[in-house]
């Protein structure tokens, strides 16, 4: 069964910068990755970035940079311009559309006890939804 993992980390050097890492563990070819915050894509979440393996990447504020890290994982850098960080308690969701499996989505957030520079363990988190 395909799985999606999500990691959120705070940058050690800039406390207002966060990076979301997501990966797909499954046999299919990825056709689209969507990253959202505040909930799953299409279910109350706000789209932050989309990454297509042939059309490229696109992101929206406060997302600063969406990039492929491997053929099955991506990273999304976020810049928080506010005085207090809303990212700390926010849920980030990643949805991987894969052929022929369909869509698989998981969510994650910064661990409550996170020190800057530390990240959540890179283990798959429970799949919230499979379309």
């Amino acid at each position: 069964t395909p799985e999606v993992w999500v990691q959120v980390q705070m940058e050690a050097t800039e406390l207002s910068s966060f990076t979301v890492h997501c990966g797909f563990l499954g046999p299919g070819s990825i056709s689209l990755v969507t990253v959202s915050w505040g909930g799953p894509d299409g279910a109350g979440g706000t789209k932050l970035a989309v990454l297509h393996p042939e059309l490229g990447t696109r992101q929206w504020a406060p997302a600063r940079q969406a990039r492929w890290e491997t053929q099955s994982s991506i990273s999304l850098a976020l810049e928080d311009s506010g005085a207090s960080s809303p990212f700390a308690n926010t849920t980030f969701c990643c949805k991987f559309a894969s052929f022929p499996e369909g869509s698989w989505e998981s969510c994650g957030s910064l661990p409550p006890s996170s020190d800057p520079g530390l990240s959540a363990p890179p283990t798959p988190v429970p799949i919230l939804r499979a379309d």
């Epitope: 940058e11 563990l25 990825i30 393996p53 990039r67 492929w68 491997t70």
Partner: antibody
Framework: EVQLQQSGAELVKPGASVKLSCTAS????????MHWLKQRPEQGLEWIGR????????EYDPRFQGKATLTADTSSNIAYLQLSSLTSEDTAVYYC???????????WGQGTTLTVSS | SIVMTQTPKFLLVSAGDRVTITCKAS??????VVWYQQKPGQSPKLLIN???NRYTGVPDRFTGSGYGTDFTFSISTVQAEDLAVYFC?????????FGGGTKLEIK
Amino acid sequence: EVQLQQSGAELVKPGASVKLSCTASGFNIKDIYMHWLKQRPEQGLEWIGRVDPTNGNSEYDPRFQGKATLTADTSSNIAYLQLSSLTSEDTAVYYCARFGIYPYFDYWGQGTTLTVSS
Amino acid sequence: SIVMTQTPKFLLVSAGDRVTITCKASQSVNKAVVWYQQKPGQSPKLLINYASNRYTGVPDRFTGSGYGTDFTFSISTVQAEDLAVYFCQQDYSSPWTFGGGTKLEIK
């Protein structure tokens, strides 16, 4: 048009250091990870490492840790590979390649030939 | 690190022949395998990604397949311009690793 233009061939003496450059045009290097690869004559490709130009963070194959240093200058859109304590084993063609907008090395530099000889 | 074992090292074929190259990963890499073509004096060029997806503009005589640890790359009808070295590569996990290459020569 996307291009990666690498610096010219180098002939250096054993024990010396060398810094190779890769100038990007047609895109912003902040949008990608810049990777460097090594190819010796009649041998396969070896991945040296990658640099994240946005923050300078780099990751290396353990075999090149201490040998290679990857940096980038986002203001001039150039990535660099510095090789130290050179030996004949470092004689090779070195390539830069981009990865990140798409999940593969879609563009490569033309390669820089490094010859280490006394 | 993941070892990619590519066979054969050399292929001597005639134009019109079908050729198959195999790549075996030392552990599962799902579909995160790429195939490159490197013509003499040139940089590698991407042919196949996600093990089987043909890159834009690549002729359909080039195909790839496989999942997990075993991957194959084929040229259905070899043409003279296919003279090159072909490499497999995994980018499932760092460090990225390549097969040793297959040198294709035309009789």
